[in-house]
Amino acid sequence: TIDTKRNISAEEGGSVILQCHFSSDTAEVTQVDWKQQDQLLAIYSVDLGWHVASVFSDRVVPGPSLGLTFQSLTMNDTGEYFCTYHTYPGGIYKGRIFLKVQESS
């Protein structure tokens, strides 16, 4: 199963950690995909390492762990984020986070 904070908030210009936690007695994680709505943010492969989409490479930092640190947030970053865990033996698990970017006070 995937465990995550369903709703998180952060300030404009600040940063936020996007994190999902996967737990299973039998399956091991082989890849994690991170998407902003339908747009790829980054992929982590246990064997191949990290790939960060070029359009986000200046704002997305891999980690901590299998999560992402999203920096220099703008109001346009408000929305749904999805983590997809690929496991072996086969199985796909998906988590959802809603990020609300608030005006800096």
Epitope: T30, I43, D47, L48, G49, H86, G90
Partner: antibody
Framework: QVQLQESGPGLVKPSETLSLTCTVS??????????LAWIRQPPGKGLEWIGS???????YYNPSLESRVTISVDTSKNQFSLKLSSVTAADTAVYYC?????????????????WGQGTMVTVSS | EIVMTQSPATLSVSPGERATLSCRAS??????LAWYQQKPGQAPRLLIY???TRATGIPARFSGSGSGTEFTLTISSLQSEDFAVYYC?????????FGGGTKVEIK
């Protein structure tokens, strides 16, 4: 540019073990960030993934073949190999070695980027 | 295991015409889909990855589309060298699986 070359016997007897080797040239397995894979194609049929190995030794196998398959890598020889035990006529096929995920870091996709030319293996007594 | 189903099994097309090949996944693979071309006696060649991105050196007449469970490979104007068998393949997750193939033949 990395190139692959399969080698091994073209004829194997039923119940014996099929052994194939893939030699990688133009790049070092020990430093390559990609999977080394085996795929087969029975005569007149489609493609079947057999399994993949990473340089660290992590292996992933087709569940339908897992009990009979061993894939290993020899970084000192820049080779990886396939062993398929207890073969039957149904294992007669062209066997391909391939590299998967060579462009992952740059482009974020995992696909079979590079293929060997294939070697035909017939199982018959 | 994700099952990939291709249709039609055979497609008869005249040179210069458009060919549309379909691939369906038994569950969502997002955009993690590749297309390969295989000519008789040759190894397959990667055409499309990420459902829609052409691999290096692949002509612009080849295009891929779709996401989730439904995918399409389109060859806009068939050339003589395009008559071949085409396979779709999902990756990840493990196990990697291929579709049964579509043979594009000369009408």
């Amino acid at each position: 540019q990395v190139q692959l070359q399969e080698s091994g016997p073209g004829l194997v007897k039923p119940s014996e073990t099929l052994s194939l080797t893939c030699t990688v040239s133009g790049g070092s397995i020990s430093s390559g960030s990609y999977y080394l894979a085996w795929i087969r194609q029975p005569p007149g049929k489609g493609l079947e993934w057999i399994g993949s190995i990473f340089r660290s030794g992590s292996t992933y196998y087709n569940p339908s073949l897992e009990s009979r398959v061993t894939i290993s890598v020899d970084t000192s020889k820049n080779q990886f190999s396939l062993k398929l035990s207890s073969v039957t006529a149904a294992d007669t096929a062209v066997y391909y070695c391939a590299i998967e995920g060579a462009n992952f870091k740059d482009f974020g996709y995992v696909a079979f980027d590079i293929w060997g030319q294939g070697t035909m293996v017939t199982v018959s007594s | 295991e994700i099952v990939m189903t291709q249709s039609p099994a055979t497609l008869s097309v005249s040179p210069g015409e458009r060919a549309t090949l379909s691939c369906r996944a038994s569950q969502s693979v997002s955009s993690n889909l590749a297309w390969y071309q295989q000519k008789p006696g040759q190894a397959p060649r990667l055409l499309i990855y990420g459902a829609s991105t052409r691999a290096t050196g692949i002509p612009a007449r080849f295009s891929g589309s779709g996401s989730g469970t439904e995918f399409t490979l389109t060859i806009s104007s068939l050339q003589s060298e395009d008559f071949a068998v085409y396979y779709c393949q999902q990756s990840p997750p493990w196990p990697r699986t291929f579709g049964g193939g579509t043979k594009v033949e000369i009408k």
